[in-house]
Amino acid sequence: MSSLPVPYKLPVSLSVGSCVIIKGTPIHSFINDPQLQVDFYTDMDEDSDIAFRFRVHFGNHVVMNRREFGIWMLEETTDYVPFEDGKQFELCIYVHYNEYEIKVNGIRIYGFVHRIPPSFVKMVQVSRDISLTSVCVCN
């Protein structure tokens, strides 16, 4: 299957019940600290506020944050990272009323509470060290 360009930008319209599904494979061995980053932008430019940033350090930890009024806020982290070295993953980000629920290969790893309404999100960008198979939004 052909891969998508990385970074990959996708215009979106999110609401409660939406799900962003990302399928891909890390392109480096975990010993080289490959990363995956997903950003939920509130406009179509990269200077806009970010409702949700999800950055995976494969084999290590996940860092989440948000950029509000141009200011990065406090990071939230989890050490539960059920990705496998060299194997395809399916990352699903579900939009719930109070939070983004993040699942990897069907396993919940975190809930990131909304501080910016999901309806403000205009673009999802997927970037860093992955071969990207697909990105889709289910409403």
Epitope: S48, L74, R115, I116, S119, V121
Partner: nanobody, 119 residues
Framework: EVQLQASGGGFVQPGGSLRLSCAAS????????MGWFRQAPGKEREFVSA?????????YYADSVKGRFTISRDNSKNTVYLQMNSLRAEDTATYYC???????????WGQGTQVTVSS
């Protein structure tokens, strides 16, 4: 439709206090980070302070107002407040409130409320 209404401004002498209010509606304002900005004549809009909907998140302040201004909110009333103490002449401006994620969308910002600090 997003609606934002700032109020509570006025004329005050240096060293005085004012409490601004921002009533928000038309979006999930009680679950949104809300911020205060100000704009003086001939100057660019300036960030003042922001507060998350979560009590566990610390508020943020511009260096110029730290220790003098306090932001708070009442989620049950969809209202955000800015308590301004030890006011200075340089605090003179029109004050606006806005949710995070909309800082560039001026049509949603309403009229703002004028604060004038002068002796």
């Amino acid at each position: 439709e997003v609606q934002l209404q700032a109020s509570g401004g006025g004329f005050v002498q240096p060293g005085g206090s004012l409490r601004l209010s921002c009533a928000a509606s038309g979006f999930g304002s009680n679950r949104s980070t809300m911020g205060w900005f100000r704009q003086a004549p001939g100057k660019e809009r300036e960030f003042v302070s922001a507060i998350s909907s979560l009590s566990s998140d610390p508020p943020y302040y511009a260096d110029s107002v730290k220790g003098r201004f306090t932001i708070s909110r009442d989620n049950s009333k969809n209202t955000v407040y800015l308590q301004m103490n030890s006011l200075r002449a340089e605090d003179t401006a029109t004050y606006y409130c806005a949710p995070a994620g909309m800082r560039g969308v001026m049509e949603y910002w309403g009229q703002g409320t004028q604060v004038t600090v002068s002796s």
